[in-house]
């Protein structure tokens, strides 16, 4: 009679994570008597996957009735496959004895596991940055297999080119991770902008996964300040306004100084929002000119989002008729305020 052969017809099998894998194995003879065992890997460190007669293998079931004496089909099904199950599986015939000895092994079936990448997580810089600055965004996705993967970056639908991507580990692994860093130049119009990381993988059937970051969490648009003197509101009274424009985020504190002395401090509350997502705010100061002998230097000082204060001044001529004058410095923060100075 011809010597027993162990036949594993499939050289490789690919299974999606969570599904069951069927590993086929048949023998050509009932002799010699002895059990079949399945192993993952070869050599002394091989892992026992299934033993016909003993051992606990809750995820493994035999495809046919392996207990029947005439059975020659020792195919198994492994349930709930994960990337950790990837490897080469060997169906091995043992000859019964004391102890049982390995008689013949099949050629092996390589099991590869297709595992979806996790949803990409995009994170931006820890601190806000101002327009014209370049900031870095990172995108991470984990747990996918096979290793081949495509990652793209977009800003408001426009593909970015300045990024660097790594897939780890470099060698063979049960699953892989991708890490990418993109550089984005901020503009004053970016409050409503989004940065998108898009990951495409064979397991996603052409429907890529996306992770997003809102630039509103990254950008700081400093305000522009303008101090103006309004026409006389009543005899000897002048209305001075400080217009705080195009700032983001809203967190802003404004202080009026009269000849360098603090006159009033307020926090921006009822702001108006511009189409680009930035804010405007205005603060008023009512000045009683008759209470002053000399010219008055009025300063609108703004602290925006915890940054160093910026200011703009206006010289109020007491001797002559009130006229609009101003001198620039810079600005940040918001509030609406009315104040009489006597």
């Amino acid at each position: 009679e011809e010597e027993l052969q162990v036949i594993q017809p499939d050289k490789s099998v690919s299974v999606a994570a969570g599904e069951s894998a069927i590993l086929h194995c048949t023998v050509t003879s009932l002799i010699p008597v002895g059990p079949i065992q399945w192993f993952r890997g070869a050599g002394p460190a091989r892992e026992l996957i299934y033993n016909q007669k003993e051992g606990h293998f809750p995820r493994v079931t035999t495809v046919s009735e392996s207990t029947k004496r005439e059975n020659m089909d020792f195919s198994i099904s492994i349930s709930n496959i994960t990337p950790a199950d990837a490897g080469t599986y060997y169906c091995v015939k043992f000859r019964k004895g004391s102890p049982d000895t390995e008689f013949k092994s099949g050629a092996g079936t390589e099991l590869s596991v297709r595992a979806k990448p996790s949803a990409p997580v995009v994170s931006g810089p820890a601190a806000r940055a101002t327009p014209q600055h370049t900031v870095s965004f990172t995108c991470e996705s984990h747990g996918f297999s096979p290793r081949d993967i495509t990652l793209k970056w977009f800003k408001n639908g426009n593909e970015l080119s300045d990024f660097q991507t790594n897939v780890d580990p470099v060698g063979e692994s049960v699953s892989y991770s991708i890490h990418s860093t993109a550089k984005v130049v901020l503009t004053r119009e970016d409050v409503h902008s989004q940065v998108i990381c898009e990951v495409a993988h064979v397991t996603l059937q052409g429907d890529p996964l996306r992770g997003t970051a809102n630039l509103s969490e990254t950008i700081r648009v400093p305000p522009t300040l303008e101090v103006t003197q309004q026409p006389v509101r009543a005899e000897n009274q002048v209305n001075v306004t400080c217009q705080v424009r195009k700032f983001y985020p809203q967190r802003l504190q404004l202080t009026w100084l009269e000849n360098g002395n603090v006159s009033r401090t307020e926090t921006a509350s009822t702001v108006t929002e511009n189409k680009d997502g930035t804010y405007n705010w205005m603060s008023w100061l009512l000045v009683n000119v008759s209470a002053h002998r000399d010219d008055v230097k009025l300063t609108c000082q703004v602290e925006h989002d915890g940054q160093p204060a910026v200011s703009k001044s206006h010289d109020l001529k007491v001797s002559a008729h009130p006229k609009e004058q101003g001198s620039n410095t810079a600005a940040e923060n918001t509030g609406s305020n009315e104040r009489n100075i006597y």
Partner: antibody, heavy 114, light 108 residues
């Protein structure tokens, strides 16, 4: 439902023999080895041996060679453990265990006493 | 034969405490063939961990197993009152199969 039902309490005189039984239900007894384990009061577990009910082939721990004999009757789905030349050292609880190791009988208490 | 030595033989732990039981083999045991059982007084042993690190059905996730070669361990991340029991390691890597002497774990 898988069950291993063992015979009841045995009280036997020194020098005699006893045959303990373990009846399997819920599975084909030929599909698995059947193991026997000894546990003396408040002590550890000792592996006695295992039998392949399909062909009667068995393996014993050296300590139990000559003391224990395992047999199986596939028609009644029952495994047996015979213990001979009993002494007080054989007083213990004896468990049968299915080869997959998660199913144990409830144990048979054997007392050897004159 | 492979002798399995468990330590400590007896120990007590407070609720919430991390507990590690060890099982040392006199010669190498393949990790596929190293199992752990839990036994409470008056009951048959229950399969607790199989193939070194896999939890049997119904075993709480605070339990874990690890090891290779001649050194294996069972760890409870946070001891609970219901974990008080005896734990036995078991090898079926080579005949004769053997159990460790057991560790009796008590709750303080």
């Amino acid at each position: 439902e898988v069950q291993l039902q063992q015979s009841g309490v045995e009280v036997v005189q020194p020098g005699a023999s006893v045959k303990l039984s373990c009846t399997a239900s819920g599975f084909n007894i030929e599909a698995y080895y059947m193991h026997w384990v000894k546990q003396r009061t408040e002590q550890g577990l000792e592996w006695i041996g295992r039998i392949d009910p399909e062909d009667g082939e068995s393996k014993y721990a050296p300590k139990f060679q000559g003391k224990a004999t395992m047999t199986a009757d596939t028609s009644s789905s029952t495994a047996y453990l015979q213990l001979s030349s009993l002494t007080s050292d054989d007083t213990a609880v004896y468990y049968c265990v299915r080869g997959s190791y998660e199913y144990w009988g409830q144990g048979t208490t054997l007392t050897v006493s004159s | 034969q492979i002798v399995l030595t468990q330590s400590p033989a007896i120990m007590s732990a407070s609720p919430g405490e991390k507990v590690t039981l060890t099982c040392s083999a006199s010669s190498s045991v393949s990790s596929s063939y190293l199992y752990w059982y839990q036994q409470k007084p008056g009951s048959s042993p229950k399969l607790w961990i199989y193939s070194t690190s896999n939890l049997a059905s119904g075993v709480p996730p605070r339990f874990s197993g690890s090891g290779s070669g001649t050194s294996y361990s069972l760890t409870i991340s946070s001891m609970q009152a219901e974990d008080a029991a005896s734990y036995f390691c078991y090898q079926w890597s080579s005949y004769p199969y053997t159990f460790g002497g057991g560790t009796k774990l008590e709750i303080k």
